[in-house]
Each structure stands twice: as structure tokens, then as C-alpha cells.
């Protein structure tokens, strides 16, 4: 399965509005996402938006709004001013770069038969999105847990002895059960074949940004939201050289000022193998 998926969606309310969704399924930290139309970036395509996990976004008409959906996926809203809706026949491409390991790109378009409001299947089609699987699993566990607790409480009401009260240990076990799928879905979102790994590592520590992005608008909103954002982040001192535990070493320089946390963390750093991933192309 290609590591980049692209989904083009026509909005049901406004037929002139389109949204491009793109995601990166491999491990490794994303250093830049480029969305283009008419072909791949650097191969005849025209840039629509560039999203940097730390330094913000840049977009060009007809792009309306580019934003991060998760740490590994983005969406780009497009406003089609033309009456004939040229977007319907256009190829949109998303390039995810993980510096310096490499860049991976995939393209997709709105199928001719698409009904408004229905999204085109991703390219490629995942059997079941890992994040959805996690949510469904978590919901199931929570529902089961609630039902079980209610059952116990009902039995409690009808029994004179307090012997069968739900113990503190039981409630802890339920909490743990509800928590695990959430972690699993986060891991699977980045690497569907991964074992659950809850450690975090700096996403962009191995690189320096001497210049080139100073003029970018930086919004706190662009920071990927999710468990990584709320997790307690290790404080890392700046130095001339940085050595990360999985052996990524490079010059680390001063970073331009930006809002939000100093480091964007990605929950998929699994040692030396977390860099390149399964970037197969079929």
C-alpha cells in the first residue's frame, strides 16, 4: 500500500467547494507537506499549499484554507470560482517530506460519478482507517464497561449484602481497558502494523532552519492536536549538536520564533527503524 493517501471531496452544500484530504501512513516525522494540482510537485504541478509542522502554512489561490487534521494528515479547502467546476477533472497531489530521509507523494482526483457530499475513496483505499478502528473499539469498550457497571449497580440494589459491590480494582481495570485502544489507535494511525509504543520523541530536532520561513504566518491552530500535544513533553536543551536515542544526529541551530510548543511530537518513534518506514509503491 502506498504510504500517502489522497481523498478529494465535493461539498454537498456548495458545489463550487472542494476539500482535499491527505495523509501519511508511514512512520517518521513530517517536515513538510506540499499540495499541488495538475500533477506532482516539481513535475508539472502547481503548488496550492505548503504546510510546515512548526512554521505555519502558505497557500495560493484557489486554496482557501489549509490545516493539519492530525500529526500525519492535512486538509485543504478549495474555492472554485469557475462555473464549469474545473476541479472535477483535476489531479491533486500531496507530498509528505521527512527530512532528510525522503519525500513520498501520491495523487488523486474526484471520480466523475461522485455525488455531492460523498467523498471519493482514498488512493489507495484503506480497508478500515486505523483511527476509526480505534474509536470504534474504544466506544465498544466504554459501552460494555458502562453496561457492566449498570448491571452491577442493579444487582447491588436488589441484594442486602454489600459483598458484590464493584471494587476499586475493578474500576481501575475498566479504566485501563478503555485507555489501551486509544493508544493502539494512535500507534496504528502512523503504522498499522506497529506494536503499541507510547514513547515520544522530538520530530524536528535533527534539523536546523536557518532561514526561509521567517515570513510565514504562524498560528497556534496549526499545531497538530491529539494525545501528543497534551502529553508532558521532555525539556530539551539547545546545543550545537543533538544526538537522539535512535541515532539521528545533525547540526541543530537556532529556530525562528513560533507559537505553540517548541517541539512537535509524533508518537511513532520506534528506534532506528522509525525513520524511513514501509515506503513501497505499487
Amino acid at each position: 500500500t502506498p504510504e500517502v493517501w489522497v481523498q478529494v471531496q465535493m461539498e454537498a452544500t456548495e458545489l463550487s467547494s472542494f476539500t482535499v484530504h491527505c495523509g501519511f501512513l508511514g512512520p517518521g516525522s513530517i517536515s513538510l507537506v506540499t499540495v499541488s494540482w495538475g500533477g506532482p510537485d516539481g513535475a508539472g504541478g502547481t503548488k496550492l499549499a505548503v504546510l510546515h509542522p512548526e512554521l505555519g502554512t502558505r497557500q495560493w489561490a484557489p486554496a482557501r484554507q489549509a490545516r493539519w487534521e492530525t500529526q500525519s494528515s492535512i486538509s485543504l479547502a478549495l474555492e472554485d470560482s469557475g462555473a464549469s467546476s474545473p476541479f472535477a477533472n483535476t489531479t491533486f497531489c500531496c507530498k509528505f517530506a521527512s527530512f532528510p530521509e525522503g519525500s513520498w507523494e501520491s495523487c488523486g482526483s474526484l471520480p466523475p460519478s461522485s455525488d455531492p457530499g460523498l467523498s471519493a475513496p482514498p488512493t489507495p483505499v484503506p480497508i478500515l482507517r486505523a483511527d476509526l478502528a480505534g474509536i470504534l473499539g474504544l466506544s465498544g469498550v466504554l459501552l460494555f464497561g458502562c453496561g457492566y457497571l449498570l448491571h452491577l449497580l442493579r444487582r447491588q440494589k436488589h441484594r442486602p449484602t454489600p459483598r458484590l459491590q464493584p471494587s476499586h480494582t475493578n474500576s481501575q481495570a475498566l479504566t485501563a481497558q478503555a485507555w489501551a485502544p486509544s493508544q493502539a489507535s494512535q500507534a496504528a494511525l502512523h503504522d498499522p502494523y506497529a506494536t503499541i509504543n507510547t514513547s515520544f520523541c522530538p520530530a524536528t530536532l535533527d534539523t536546523a532552519h536557518p532561514n526561509g520561513w521567517a515570513s510565514l504566518p504562524t498560528h497556534a491552530a496549526h499545531q497538530p492536536q491529539g494525545p501528543a500535544a497534551s502529553a508532558s513533553t521532555p525539556i530539551l536543551a539547545r546545543g550545537s549538536f543533538v544526538s537522539v536515542e535512535n541515532g539521528l544526529y545533525t547540526q541543530a541551530g537556532e529556530r525562528p520564533p513560533h507559537t505553540g510548543p517548541g517541539l512537535t511530537l509524533f508518537p511513532d518513534c520506534r528506534g532506528p527503524r522509525a525513520v524511513e518506514g514501509r515506503f513501497g509503491v505499487r
Epitope: E105, H209, G212, R273, E276, R278
Partner: antibody
Amino acid sequence: EVQLVQSGAEVKKPGASVKVSCKASGYTFTDYWIYWVRQAPGQGLEWMGTIDTSDAKTSYNQKFRGRVTMTRDTSTSTVYMELSSLRSEDTAVYYCARDFIITVNYPVVDYWGQGTLVTVSS
Amino acid sequence: QIVLTQSPATLSLSPGERATLSCSAGSSVNYMHWFQQKPGQAPRLLIYSTSNLASGVPARFSGSGSGTDYTLTISSLEPEDFAVYYCQQRSSLPFTFGQGTKLEIK
């Protein structure tokens, strides 16, 4: 036509520095990273580092820590690799290469400079 | 760093024969890239991400493998295939190349 043209051969004394240039043409310079590889006479290939031409961020092989510096000049579409504190074992052909982008259903191709021979001798 | 060991160091074959070149990694890597280099020339990308042919590379070249063991196969050797072949990993920094396999005419 995509081309990477490197500067000419250099002869340097131990302890000196050398700065090799790599001029790109035939494509949008900032769309592709450039990496440097060296090859000592009769030896294999060795990755030295990569520069992101769009924002000049770099990633270096730790072996060259503190001795290698990669820069770029977008106005001339040129990347530079400077190696300092030269020693005899730095005698090699230095190549710049345009990094390839893996794009589904599109051709994947790399481009290399012709190489620059740097000789370090007293 | 991940050490890549290529075998054999030299492979002597005749045109039309099948060539099998191996690359063994000191620790598991996700993908392997293969390069071809002819005397006096810069290297050229042959295979990326283990099994995908780069642009312009003939179909007689193929790649396979996973984990620590990877293979480059040339199904039927042509005279222009005699060169040095290098494997490269990008799963861990620093990126490393194998020491090369020299494919020579028997």
C-alpha cells in the same frame, strides 16, 4: 534538461579547507533536496549530508561533525559543500546529487553532478 | 550506524546469465535502494524502496528482500550491465552504502 554542474578539481594542503559548488538547472531549485556523497579512490560511496534547498536546513553524517558545512544560494541555484581541516584521507571524488521523490505512478529519477576530485597532499 | 555488507565482492558471469547480488544489513532496515556505477561515471539509481524500478531502468533488473537481507537480481545480463553495484539504506542516520559488488565479464 536537468543538470548538476560541479566546480573543478582542487588540490589542497592538509589543514586547509575546500569549497565545492554544485549548480543546478532545468528544474525548480527549491523543489528538491541536494545531498553529497564522496568516493575515495578505489573505494565505495559515503553519504556526507543533505541540504533542503527550500529553507537551507541540513543533516550531516556525524563522521564529518564540525568539518562539513552545506549552504545554498537560491539566486544562482547553487549548493556549496565546504570541508575544513582537510587530511590526506579526504582525497576523493565529491558528488552532489538531486534527491529523488517517490511518487506513485510517476517516474522516479535521480540526477548527479559529474564529480569533483579533491586531492589533499602536502 | 548500520553497516551494509554486500556479497560477493566480485561476481564473474557471462552475458545472458542470471546475476544475484546480496546486501546484508547489520540491523533491520525498512527499505533498500540500489545504485549502479560504471568506471569514471557518477552512480545511478536503479531500484528504490527495495523493489521499485527507477525511471529508464530495464525490466531485467529486480529487487527483493526485507529486514536484514536484500537482493538485486539481473535476469539476463547484457554487456552494459557490467559495473559496480551499491546498496543503500535510509532507515537510520547516517545513511550508509554497502562496499559494493563488482560485476565483471567472465
